[in-house]
């Protein structure tokens, strides 16, 4: 196994519909083929998977369908997007990128993104 | 704990095949590359073949057209068909899984099975 650098931005600000967008970008040092993309989140010191998906270079990427993940990919980049976040999903969300193919394999684990979710305020009832 | 099982090593005479499996007790098929590796006495382990969950292979120049690997992932199960054997593919064969969980890279190891290729 070969370590790689991943790259992500530090801090990311969810939207008041609780989608939150980033981009990885991992330094390959040949032209892998099949690419491992697995985002992790870090709370209270416990990792759990948030999402993963597995793609061939020049297809899409393509996550479960019942997955809060979705992305594409474009050359060493992939802009990973994650829905459905409320507060409580405030963390630290890791990407870690593993090069399948071809040998040797390489495993990259960028140092996260905080991502911060706050619930919308819920509209005062109108009186008409 | 993830365990590896090989077995299907044997005598064989020159020109003749073997399949060896590799059992695994947990589920890593779907997320680690699987390989076969060998060692012969007094020389390194090298690896003879590897699939991804992809399902992209590699082979040692040395088995090319001679060996297949191929996994069932319904059996946790990885397989090498060797065919047009040598004496020198006579080695310990290892299976391997190698790839990460969460933020630790993994890697796994069987315990070897012994194929002698000899008339």
């Known amino acids: 196994c070969k370590a790689m650098h991943v790259a992500q931005p530090a801090v990311v600000l969810a939207s008041s519909r609780g989608i939150a967008s980033f981009v990885c970008e991992y330094a390959s040092p040949g032209k892998a083929t099949e690419v491992r993309v697995t985002v992790l989140r870090q709370a209270d010191s416990q990792v759990t998977e948030v999402c993963a998906a597995t793609y061939m270079m020049g297809n899409e990427l393509t996550f479960l369908d019942d997955s809060i993940c979705t992305g594409t990919s474009s050359g060493n980049q992939v802009n990973l997007t994650i829905q459905g976040l409320r507060a409580m999903d405030t963390g630290l969300y890791i990407c870690k990128v593993e090069l399948m193919y071809p040998p040797p394999y390489y495993l990259g684990i960028g140092n996260g993104t905080q991502i911060y979710v706050i619930d919308p305020e819920p509209c005062p009832d109108s009186d008409f | 704990e993830v365990q590896l099982v090989e077995s299907g090593g044997g005598l064989v005479q020159p020109g003749g095949s073997l399949r060896l499996s590799c059992a695994a007790s947990?589920?890593?098929?779907?997320?680690?590359?699987m390989g076969w590796y060998r060692q012969a006495p007094g020389k390194q382990r090298d690896l003879v073949a590897s699939?991804?969950?992809?399902?992209?292979?590699n082979y040692a120049d040395s088995v090319k057209g001679r060996f297949t690997i191929s996994r069932d992932g319904a059996k946790n199960t990885v397989y090498l068909q060797m065919n047009s054997l040598k004496p020198e593919d006579t080695a310990v064969y290892y299976c391997?899984?190698?790839?990460?969980?969460?933020?630790?890279?993994?890697?796994?190891w069987g315990q070897g099975t012994q194929v002698t290729v000899s008339s």
């Open positions: 947990g589920n890593i098929f779907t997320r680690n590359v």
């Open positions: 699939i991804t969950p992809g399902g992209n292979i």
């Open positions: 391997n899984a190698h790839g990460s969980i969460l933020l630790d890279r993994i890697e796994y």
